[in-house]
Structure formats: C-alpha cells, structure tokens
Amino acid sequence: QGGTRSPRCDCAGDFHKKIGLFCCRGCPAGHYLKAPCTEPCGNSTCLVCPQDTFLAWENHHNSECARCQACDEQASQVALENCSAVADTRCGCKPGWFVECQVSQCVSSSPFYCQPCLDCGALHRHTRLLCSRRDTDCGTCLPGFYEHGDGCVSCPTSTLGSCPERCAAVCGWRQMF
C-alpha cells in the first residue's frame, strides 16, 4: 500500500498467475477475461461466453471465447453433442453411417466425412461386425443364398433351376437335371 513495486506471485492457491501488474485469479471454464484483477491476488473480471462460443479450460488470458464449430452438412456430419459454454460441438455421423477420415494418420480432430454403412441384409449376407467406427463387416451368405461371384444368389425354388456345385452344397440339391 502506497509503494511502487509490483508484488511477487505468492498468492494462496495455485490458480493465480501474473496478468499485467498483478497476480490474478483466472477465469473458470466457460468464461473469458474481461479485465485483469486490479490488486495483488485479486479476482479478474470474468464474463460468461456468449451463445455459440466456448472456452473448455480455466484460463488467465483469453479475452474472447472460441467460436463453436459447425458440423459439415456437405460431409453428412451431424451434431452428436451441441456446443455449450465449456465444450465445443461434437460432430459425428448419424446412425447407419460411419466416419471416413480424410487423412491417413487419423486423430479425433482430423477432418472426416460420413459414409452410409453397408446393409449386409440387402446383400443377403450375415452381419459379422456392426458399423460404428468403420464400415459394416459382412460375412457369409444368409440361409437360402449361396456364393456366386462377388454376391449371394438365391437358392432356386424348384429343381428346374440350374444349381452349380456350390449351390448344391448350400441349397441341398443333390440331384442335377
């Protein structure tokens, strides 16, 4: 009081940091720094992040909040979690779609687009692995279907249909006409 030397940062608690002249308590997540504290070990003036902005961490220096990301509709993305004052929008894919990363070394922040999951049923195949982080993994042909080329072909409904060896093995036709 009355002196001129700025105080050392020896405030109680560990959330004080020098901002300008003084050691200040920072702003909690979801708040931005409007003005630094005006006395040693004081509280900074912090305001809540406006709508559509956020700050995820406690901070001493952010004088504005980050703008919430918009999910990329052209990449078929949807908001899995809406933006809040403390967390950004979490974008992902709607049910029945999976994330296809746009870069080879894929991390959570990598750009991505959403691809429709393979419908194994429509391909007359068993679903071996459900689609979530990657595409559906389809298995063998469903009962009543047999492998033919890349697809599954329906077993013939009568003995008049042609039934090659694989067909006969799967469909149960023993006699060939």
């Epitope: 009081q1 030397r5 700025s6 002249l21 005006t38 006395e39 003036t45």
Partner: antibody, heavy 116, light 107 residues
Framework: EVQLVESGGGSVQPGGSLRLSCAAS????????MSWVRQAPGKGLEWISY????????YYADSVKGRFTISRDNAKNSLYLQMNSLRAEDTAVYYC?????????WGQGTPVTVSS | DIVMTQSPSSLSASVGDRVTITCQAS??????LSWYQQKPGKAPKLLIN???NLETGVPSRFSGSGSGTDFTFTISSLQPEDIATYYC?????????FGQGTRLEIK
C-alpha cells in the same frame, strides 16, 4: 459509450493545493483499476498514481509520493487526486485512465499550472 | 524502475511508406507492452496491448511484435491521419513507465 471527464484543474501558487476529479460513465466503474497520468508542456507521458477497483490498494510515482493522494468513490463513479505542496514541476495536463492491463480509455485531460 | 528506450525520437516519412518504431525495456517485461497514439491537444489512444494485440476499431495497418525486452511497432502504409506522437509503455511492474515518444511527420 465509455467516458472519462476530468475537472478541477487550474492555476495555483507553489505550495498550494488542488483536487482533481474524474467522472466515469458507460462502464462498471467499480470493476476497474484507475490511474492518473500527466504530461508536462512539450514533454512525454508520466504515470503518477494507481488505485485498485475497491480502493484498497494505492501506488504512487516517487515524484509525487507523500504529496498526492489518489482516492475513489464507486457509488459516485468518481476518481480523485488530492494534490498538496504543489511545485512548478507539477505543471502539466492531468489525465485519468482506466486500467485493463494497458490503459484502454483516457479522459480529455485537465491542465494544472503551478506558478508564482 | 524499468526504463523504456524508444527510437527514433522523431521521423519523417511519405504517405504509403512502411514506418517502424522500436522500444527497448531495461529488463524483461514478458509481453506487457502497449503502444499509444497521441495527436496534438488530444488524449493518448491505445492502439496495441500485450505487445501485439490490436485494439478493436484500430486499422490493421498498425501492428506490434516482440517480447522480453525488444519490441517493434509498425505502420505498414502511412496515411496522412497517422501524423502523431507514438508512445510505448510497460505494465509489467510498478511504477508504470513510458518511452519518451516518437514524433511522426509527413515528408
């Protein structure tokens, strides 16, 4: 709109006293530290005093320590500078300024002349 | 006290010129440095805080850089309305101190 308006300047003889005022409007005065900065004729800027938002902490430049007193009345949105034992070298334009790290808002200044 | 040494003390430049002013602190002030513009008979106006943050409404031709002890203020393309005196100021440690100013004139 943020406004700071100084008043109380004038002419005084060496050894005399003056009380400067700074009326604040357009912002939450009680949330900000405030300072007085002066500028002698044809010279640069000189910080002379600072007061915390609550008024509990005050600081002074060596050139005015013991002669000048900074104070504030948050209820009246006003900042003051009581200047005693004035000297010729105190002749200057006196500005009040809002502290937000840097001095982001300044008044227009009030001139003080100390002369016999 | 921290001494702020500003240079040059005055300079003359033409409209459109790139203008640079430097400020040196006698000790480390991190990035707690601001730049002000003062026109004759007027109060100073804050242009830049925290060494490089442009104040809202200040034209983008003004910029600042530096940290520690050495700082630079630049006007990328001088305009007639930029004629003024420019001051640096540290707010790292009390007492707050200013550079002696740089008077900028048009050639």
């Amino acid at each position: 709109e943020v406004q700071l308006v100084e008043s109380g300047g004038g002419s005084v003889q060496p050894g005399g006293s003056l009380r400067l005022s700074c009326a604040a409007s357009g912002f939450t005065f009680s949330s900000y530290g405030m300072s007085w900065v002066r500028q002698a004729p044809g010279k640069g800027l000189e910080w002379i005093s600072y007061i915390s938002s609550s008024g509990g902490h005050t600081y002074y430049a060596d050139s005015v320590k013991g002669r000048f007193t900074i104070s504030r009345d948050n209820a009246k949105n006003s900042l003051y500078l009581q200047m005693n034992s004035l000297r010729a070298e105190d002749t200057a334009v006196y500005y009040c300024a809002r502290y937000s790290g840097a001095f982001d808002r300044w008044g227009q200044g009030t001139p003080v002349t100390v002369s016999s | 006290d921290i001494v702020m040494t500003q240079s040059p003390s005055s300079l003359s430049a033409s409209v459109g010129d790139r203008v640079t002013i430097t400020c040196q602190a006698s000790q480390d002030i991190t990035n707690y440095l601001s730049w002000y513009q003062q026109k004759p008979g007027k109060a100073p106006k804050l242009l830049i805080n925290d060494a490089s943050n442009l104040e809202t409404g200040v034209p983008s031709r003004f910029s600042g850089s530096g940290s520690g002890t050495d700082f630079t203020f630049t006007i990328s393309s001088l305009q007639p309305e930029d004629i003024a005196t420019y001051y640096c100021q540290q707010y790292d440690t009390l007492p707050i101190t200013f550079g002696q100013g740089t008077r900028l004139e048009i050639k």
